[in-house]
């Protein structure tokens, strides 16, 4: 989580701050959504359980050329302990279900808000 504050960060970002920043970014995406997010691209749905940060990144990293979610992809990589590359899938994906990126972001946002409320930051 150290890198989540960016290059100017004076030290490690507290986990609660990192999660709040990720929530803020997802809120920005949902608020600023004019046209269909990422041209209506579809991604694998995920189980919102332990390990879901990596699973979310694995899903979203397969969306290319969508500047709206680039910051989210970077932030999620800070929560995921291993390197994620396109085409990589974990058991947390609901492999028979694809949803629009906009719905994926909405579902992820709600879950992260609940984690924040419950004090589960990692």
């Amino acid at each position: 989580l150290t890198c989540l504050g960016g290059f100017a960060s004076p030290g490690p970002v507290p986990p609660s701050t990192a999660l709040r920043e990720l929530i803020e970014e997802l809120v920005n995406i949902t608020q600023n959504q004019k046209a269909p997010l990422c041209n209506g691209s579809m991604v694998w749905s995920i189980n919102l359980t332990a390990g879901m940060y990596c699973a979310a990144l694995e899903s979203l990293i397969n969306v290319s050329g969508c500047s709206a979610i680039e910051k989210t992809q970077r932030m999620l990589s800070g929560f995921c302990p291993h390197k994620v590359s396109a085409g990589q899938f974990s058991s947390l994906h609901v492999r028979d279900t694809k949803i629009e990126v906009a719905q994926f972001v909405k579902d992820l946002l709600l879950h992260l808000k609940k984690l924040f409320r419950e004090g589960q930051f990692n």
Epitope: E24, L48, R117
Partner: antibody, heavy 125, light 112 residues
């Protein structure tokens, strides 16, 4: 519009169980926490527990642990509270309430903003 | 468990009065995420409670501006700046920061 409609009044014998339902409309229960609060006659409010209907995770007050079970059925938008081993002091009005989130605020936990009408449970031999 | 103690337990006041109800928690109720989930509810006889204030001082939508909340740490207050006839009710504080979440015992506001 948002509504929480609870099941009707119940009269139960000591030692039996009661299951109270709370049917939600006007919102998705997976976007909420659903709470149960009770109020004995002439007494104050007592929080019993809550459920996250999206995953079934529950929190209970220790004094009710083992006697209370809170569940939710997303398909019917209904939350349930079951209380077992009833005793006379469980006579109370039982309320369900929700706490909701929206997509447009970073920190939008709105506490218990909508409540059911209450269900009177009377425990008497 | 965290105890929430309200004072006074009952209070007589007149329409137009400024009224303050206090709520003290037995320990600090700042949540690990930095928020303080201190809420105030109003209840009238035979009715379900209604949310007035959340997170110490945020007024819920539709709640008149005469209701305000303040405080920090362990000491909190609900103020009604100018009592209206419909404000006579019982008021409860509630902490949702540490499980088990707990209500205060209530403050009954009566007409003098």
């Amino acid at each position: 519009q948002v509504q929480l409609v609870q099941s009707g009044a119940e009269v139960k014998k000591p030692g039996s169980s009661v299951k109270v339902s709370c049917k939600a409309s006007g919102f998705y229960i997976k976007d909420t926490y659903m709470h149960w609060v009770r109020q004995a006659p002439g007494q104050g409010l007592e929080w019993m527990g809550t459920i996250d209907p999206a995953n079934g995770n529950t929190k209970y007050v220790p004094k009710f642990q083992g006697r209370v079970t809170i569940t939710a059925d997303e398909s019917t938008s209904t939350a349930y509270m079951e209380l077992s081993s009833l005793r006379s002091e469980d006579t109370a009005v039982y309320y369900c309430a929700r706490s909701i989130y929206d997509d447009y605020h970073v920190d939008d936990y709105y506490a218990m903003d909508y409540w059911g009408q209450g269900t009177l449970v009377t425990v008497s031999s | 468990d965290i105890q929430m103690t309200q004072s006074p337990s009952s209070l007589s006041a007149s329409v137009g009065d400024r009224v303050t109800i206090t709520c003290r928690s037995s320990q600090n109720i700042v949540h690990i995420n930095g928020n303080t989930y201190l809420e105030w509810y109003q209840q009238k006889p035979g009715k379900a409670p209604k949310l007035l204030i959340y997170k110490i001082s945020d007024r819920f939508s539709g709640v008149p501006s005469r209701f305000s909340g303040s405080g920090s740490g362990t000491d909190f207050t609900l103020t009604i700046s100018s009592l209206q006839p419909e404000d006579f009710a019982t008021y409860y504080c509630f902490q949702g920061s540490h499980v088990p979440w707990t209500f205060g015992q209530g403050t009954k506001l009566e007409i003098k």
